[in-house]
């Protein structure tokens, strides 16, 4: 008996060929001997089967001895043995229809679980193997689960169902809802404008939800909410914003915040959360602000940084085009009685400059100038 695998919702063509290349009488029946379709002379006739409105043939090939049964919009319950009766012969085809669905939404938050459920006909014993977009293989029976979804799991999952040495392939598009970056650091000189961007790693037709940025300043004992906002169909509207600092927010995606001035009291780290409509859980992105200040007071040239710096970062003070006068893995360095000239304060990581502030030291009879 020939076995044909089909997919729920798909189309299948079961072939039946006569040895005579001409239009002769044929019938397709199911295992209960209920007629599905056949011919009467040159016309198609249909029986009382449940396939009635979804079953057809290919009238144009009857005169070549081809009498297919074409079933559209397959259902699991269409799984059956179909019998083609032609020329006193019986051709049997076993049709097995499978369905594979994500039993939750296909748009999932980072860290959530994905469960794929296989619908299969009674009596079948299929095996399923799925390959994620990043090439990870998972195997299972009627259900497959993947916990802790990551951003790289976004994309097309290809699942192969195996039954009777035959296979049928399913493709399921999964969207992992997350920010493009889990964390980011912005380095700024005191007084500069600060831009925070929170690009999403996905695109959807309509995006609705609400969000908030909580900020923990290095100098503060507790965190505070800097801004709350709503998102409606990708349009951003601010609900509430603190007076200090007076943040501004872009009206369109990607989420974009502007801090008019980088000041030491703002240095620290924030957590932007975004709750999406009809989704449990929230998206998170951490953002950090490091602020640098270079000052000269009397005979002391000081360079300081505030905010979350890693212990391996180097802070240096050097006169332009000269070797560093002072270089430490600390958050403040200074030079006593600096000589006149353009001094550079540098924050660097393994030789790569992250932040630079210049201060001009005038001869001792003048006052310092900060460019």
């Amino acid at each position: 008996k020939k076995v044909v695998l089909g997919k729920k919702g798909d189309t299948v063509e079961l072939t039946c060929t006569a040895s005579q290349k001409k239009s002769i009488q044929f019938h397709w029946k199911n295992s209960n001997q209920i007629k599905i379709l056949g011919n009467q002379g040159s016309f198609l006739t249909k029986g009382p089967s449940k396939l009635n409105d979804r079953a057809d043939s290919r009238r144009s090939l009857w005169d070549q001895g081809n009498f297919p049964l074409i079933i559209k919009n397959l259902k699991i319950e269409d799984s059956d043995t179909y019998i083609c009766e032609v020329e006193d012969q019986k051709e049997e085809v076993q049709l097995l229809v499978f369905g594979l669905t994500a039993n939750s939404d296909t748009h999932l938050l980072q860290g959530q679980s994905l469960t794929l459920t296989l619908e299969s006909p009674p009596g079948s014993s299929p095996s399923v193997q799925c390959r994620s977009p990043r090439g990870k293989n998972i195997q299972g029976g009627k259900t497959l689960s993947v916990s802790q979804l990551e951003l790289q799991d976004s994309g097309t999952w290809t699942c192969t169902v195996l039954q009777n040495q035959k296979k049928v392939e399913f493709k399921i598009d999964i969207v992992v809802l997350a920010f493009q970056k889990a964390s980011s650091i912005v380095y700024k000189k005191e007084g500069e404008q600060v831009e925070f961007s929170f690009p999403l790693a996905f695109t959807v037709e309509k995006l609705t939800g609400s969000g908030e940025l909580w900020w923990q300043a290095e100098r503060a004992s507790s965190s505070k909410s800097w801004i709350t906002f709503d998102l409606k169909n990708k349009e951003v509207s601010v609900k509430r914003v603190t007076q200090d600092p007076k943040l501004q927010m872009g009206k369109k995606l990607p989420l974009h915040l502007t801090l008019p001035q980088a000041l030491p009291q703002y240095a620290g780290s924030g957590n932007l959360t975004l709750a999406l409509e009809a989704k449990t859980g929230k998206l998170h992105q951490e953002v950090n602000l490091v602020v640098m200040r270079a000052t000269q007071l009397q005979k002391n040239l000081t360079c300081e940084v505030w905010g979350p710096t890693s212990p391996k970062l180097m802070l240096s003070l050097k006169l332009e085009n000269k070797e560093a006068k002072v270089s430490k893995r600390e958050k403040a360095v200074w030079v006593l009685n600096p000589e006149a000239g353009m001094w550079q304060c540098l924050l660097s990581d393994s030789g790569q400059v992250l932040l630079e502030s210049n201060i001009k030291v005038l001869p001792t009879w003048s006052t310092p100038v900060q460019p």
Epitope: G6, T11, R59, P68
Partner: antibody, heavy 118, light 107 residues
Framework: QVQLVQSGAEVKKPGASVKVSCKAS????????FSWVRQAPGQGLEWMGI????????SYAQKFQGRVTMTRDTSTSTVYMELSSLRSEDTAVYYC???????????WGQGTTVTVSS | DIQMTQSPSSLSASVGDRVTITCQAS??????LNWYQQKPGKAPKLLIY???SLETGVPSRFSGSGSGTDFTLTISSLQPEDFATYYC?????????FGQGTKVEIK
């Protein structure tokens, strides 16, 4: 959900052959029949033939008999149409389409332009 | 071979108009008649199969009728996206044959 993607445009000399491919995705390739239809510039649609699912049996329009060969490769979910002894009148856009019998051709490829010129 | 003749070969109409295209088969083809829409540079799209059944996803302003040798495609209220060429096709016997097409243009 089923999509058909055809090979790129071809320029051929008279007497040569052309082989156009049509790759199916998003469905169960081995369960479908495919028709090939062509359309000369500014003209109507012309059916060339069909390749059936099981065993790849074919039926060609009399006009193309002897010049056309339709094949299928289940491993790559691809159907092919080869037309030989090309002449200038074969200049046309060639389409593959999933053929669901009495219900017509419900999914079409984007078309492949074949130009026959000396 | 079964000949399919469409009329008119072209027509001008305005948005909102009711448009009727006819297709005649050279012999009785029962209800084995399909209708397609084709826009310039694009592949045809199936609208109606077996003379009167609307293909999934096709707007209900399209309807088909007829049996035997005479068939009709009707667009009840023409929309801007409906300006295209329409083809009938018989699936009664091989070779499958198409009508020569009816071009629906903006008046």
């Amino acid at each position: 959900q089923v999509q058909l993607v055809q090979s790129g445009a071809e320029v051929k000399k008279p007497g040569a052959s052309v082989k156009v491919s049509c790759k199916a995705s998003g469905g169960t390739f081995s369960n479908y029949a495919f028709s090939w239809v062509r359309q000369a510039p500014g003209q109507g649609l012309e059916w060339m033939g069909i390749i059936n699912p099981s065993g790849g049996s074919t039926s060609y329009a009399q006009k193309f008999q002897g010049r056309v060969t339709m094949t299928r490769d289940t491993s790559t979910s691809t159907v092919y149409m080869e037309l030989s002894s090309l002449r200038s009148e074969d200049t046309a856009v060639y389409y593959c389409a999933r053929d669901v019998g009495d219900r017509g051709m419900d999914v079409w490829g984007q078309g492949t332009t074949v130009t026959v010129s000396s | 071979d079964i000949q399919m003749t469409q009329s008119p070969s072209s027509l001008s109409a305005s948005v909102g108009d009711r448009v009727t295209i006819t297709c005649q088969a050279s012999q009785d083809i029962s209800n084995y008649l399909n209708w397609y829409q084709q826009k310039p540079g694009k592949a045809p799209k199936l609208l109606i199969y077996k003379a009167s059944s609307l293909e999934t996803g096709v707007p209900s302003r399209f309807s088909g009728s007829g049996s035997g040798t005479d068939f009709t495609l009707t667009i009840s209220s023409l929309q801007p996206e409906d300006f295209a060429t329409y083809y009938c096709q018989q699936s009664f016997s091989s070779p499958l044959t198409f009508g020569q097409g009816t071009k629906v243009e903006i008046k």
